[in-house]
C-alpha cells in the first residue's frame, strides 16, 4: 500500500454508504470502490503523475526552501462515475447510470 | 498567511527563476507570482473550494476513520499563464505571451 514514503499513486478505498450517512438516499450499492490518491510528490516528478508546470515549479521551490513551501499534492486528476439506485423526491427507486465524479480514475501531482 | 489550521486558500509565492535553475533559459522576468494553495480541507467543505463528489466522500470517510483515510488536499484547480522572454535555438530572445499553467488562479479541495 502507498504510505508517506511511496510515490503518488491510486490505492483502494472501499466506501460504505452507511458509514458516511448516504444510505438514507442511496439504496444500492451498499458500498463502492472510490479509490484514494496516496503518496508523495517527490523530486523529480515522473511523467505518470502528469505534473502541471506549477507543480514542477513548486516542487523545485520546495527543494530549495522546504520549510517555506510545501510539496505538490497527490490528488485525483480524473474521476469516473458510478451507477446508483436512489430514491427520488416521491420515494420512487430510480437508477442513475452515471453519478459523476465518485471514483478516482487517475492520480497526479498538483 | 494560511497555515495548517486555516482553510484552503490562495497565498502568495514569489518564485525567483535563479532559485529553481530556470534562469539558464528564461531571461525575463527574473521572478514571478506563482501563488500557492495552502490550508486544510475541513468538514464541511465550503462551496468556495469547489469540492468534487469524491472530495466530499473522502472528507466524510476521513471524519469517521481519520487514521485510515486522509483529508482532501488543497490544490490549484485553475491555472493562469505568464509571459516569459526566452532564448530560442538560435539564441534569439523571443517572447512567449502565454506560458501556460504557471500561476494559480483558483484553489480547491480535491
Amino acid at each position: 500500500s502507498a504510505g508517506a514514503g511511496s510515490h503518488c499513486q491510486k490505492t483502494s478505498l472501499r466506501v460504505n454508504f452507511e458509514d458516511i450517512g448516504w444510505d438514507s438516499w442511496i439504496i444500492a450499492p451498499k458500498e463502492y470502490e472510490a479509490y484514494e490518491c496516496k503518496g508523495g510528490c517527490f523530486f523529480p516528478l515522473a511523467d505518470d503523475v502528469t505534473p502541471t508546470k506549477h507543480a514542477i515549479v513548486q516542487t523545485l521551490v520546495h527543494l530549495k526552501f522546504p520549510t517555506k513551501v510545501g510539496k505538490a499534492c497527490c490528488v485525483p486528476t480524473k474521476l469516473s462515475p458510478i451507477s446508483v439506485l436512489y430514491k427520488d423526491d416521491m420515494g420512487v427507486p430510480t437508477l442513475k447510470y452515471h453519478y459523476e465524479g465518485m471514483s478516482v480514475a487517475e492520480c497526479g501531482c498538483r | 498567511s494560511a497555515g495548517a489550521g486555516s482553510h484552503c486558500q490562495k497565498t502568495s509565492l514569489r518564485v525567483n527563476f535563479e532559485d529553481i535553475g530556470w534562469d539558464s533559459w528564461i531571461i525575463a522576468p527574473k521572478e514571478y507570482e506563482a501563488y500557492e494553495c495552502k490550508g486544510g480541507c475541513f468538514f464541511p467543505l465550503a462551496d468556495d473550494v469547489t469540492p468534487t463528489k469524491h472530495a466530499i466522500v473522502q472528507t466524510l470517510v476521513h471524519l469517521k476513520f481519520p487514521t485510515k483515510v486522509g483529508k482532501a488536499c488543497c490544490v490549484p484547480t485553475k491555472l493562469s499563464p505568464i509571459s516569459v522572454l526566452y532564448k530560442d535555438d538560435m539564441g534569439v530572445p523571443t517572447l512567449k505571451y502565454h506560458y501556460e499553467g504557471m500561476s494559480v488562479a483558483e484553489c480547491g479541495c480535491r
Epitope: - | 509571459s83 516569459v84 538560435m90 530572445p93 523571443t94 517572447l95
Partner: antibody
C-alpha cells in the same frame, strides 16, 4: 552563418516604384519575423514594416509614413523577403536593411541597399 | 507612438574611462515584468548590431565591458573601460508596441 543579402535598390524618380528583395540563409527563415528598417543618410533608424509567421497568417504591420504605399511579403519556400515600394517620395531616400528576429528583437541584419528618390 | 529620447547626442570619452548613454521613453516600456528595451551599436559603414536586450542582457559575443540597466522609462548603457573599437553610434529601441521605435542615436568618440 546567418546571412541576409538585400538587392533591388537604386535611383528612382518621385512617384516611381521599386521592389527590394532579401535572400536569407543560415537560419530557419520560416521561424522568424522579418522586417525592413531604413536609415536616411546621416540620420537615425526607422522601422518600416514587418511580416509575421505562417502561423500568424503572415500578418503585416507598417509605419504610418509608408502605409498604403509599401507592401511587405515573404516566400518561405525561397527564404526570401520583399518590399514593394510605390508612390516613392524624396523622403524615402535611405539605406534599407532587411532584418530578421522574433516578436521581441531585431536579431539579424543585412548590409543594406541604398534607395535614392530624386528627379 | 512611444518616443525614445537619447542623451547626449554625442560624447567624447578617454580610452579606459567610462562612457554612459541615457535613453528615456515617453511611456513605460515594461510589461509582464519584462523591459522591452534594446541597445544597438552601429559602426561606420556597417549595419546595426544587437548589444543589449531586455534592458540588461548582453547579446551574443558582446564583450563584458558593455552593460545595460534601468526599467520603466529610464535606461542606461554603460561602456567601461572604453576601447578604441567602441567608436560608433549607439541606438536604444523599444519593442513593447508597434511601431517599434528607436532613439535618435548617440555618437561616441575618443577624447
Amino acid at each position: 552563418e546567418v546571412q541576409l543579402v538585400e538587392s533591388g535598390g537604386g535611383l528612382v524618380q518621385p512617384g516611381g516604384s521599386l521592389r527590394l528583395s532579401c535572400a536569407a540563409s543560415g537560419f530557419t527563415f520560416s521561424n522568424y519575423w522579418m522586417n525592413w528598417v531604413r536609415q536616411a543618410p546621416g540620420k537615425g533608424l526607422e522601422w518600416v514594416a514587418h511580416i509575421r509567421l505562417k502561423s500568424d497568417n503572415y500578418a503585416t504591420h507598417y509605419a504610418e509614413s509608408v502605409r498604403g504605399r509599401f507592401t511587405i511579403s515573404r516566400d518561405d519556400s525561397k527564404n526570401s523577403l520583399y518590399l514593394q515600394m510605390n508612390s516613392l517620395k524624396t523622403e524615402d531616400t535611405a539605406v534599407y536593411y532587411c532584418t530578421g528576429g522574433s516578436n521581441y528583437v531585431f536579431a539579424f541584419w543585412g548590409q543594406g541597399t541604398l534607395v535614392t528618390v530624386s528627379s | 507612438d512611444i518616443v525614445m529620447t537619447q542623451s547626449p547626442d554625442s560624447l567624447a570619452v578617454s580610452l579606459g574611462e567610462r562612457a554612459t548613454i541615457n535613453c528615456r521613453a515617453s511611456e513605460s516600456v515594461d510589461n509582464y515584468g519584462i523591459s522591452f528595451m534594446n541597445w544597438f551599436q552601429q559602426k561606420p559603414g556597417q549595419p546595426p548590431k544587437l548589444l543589449i536586450y531586455a534592458a540588461s542582457n548582453q547579446g551574443s559575443g558582446v564583450p563584458d565591458r558593455f552593460s545595460g540597466s534601468g526599467s520603466g522609462t529610464d535606461f542606461t548603457l554603460t561602456i567601461s573601460p572604453l576601447q578604441a573599437e567602441d567608436v560608433a553610434v549607439y541606438f536604444c529601441q523599444q519593442s513593447k508596441e508597434v511601431p517599434w521605435t528607436f532613439g535618435q542615436g548617440t555618437k561616441l568618440e575618443i577624447k
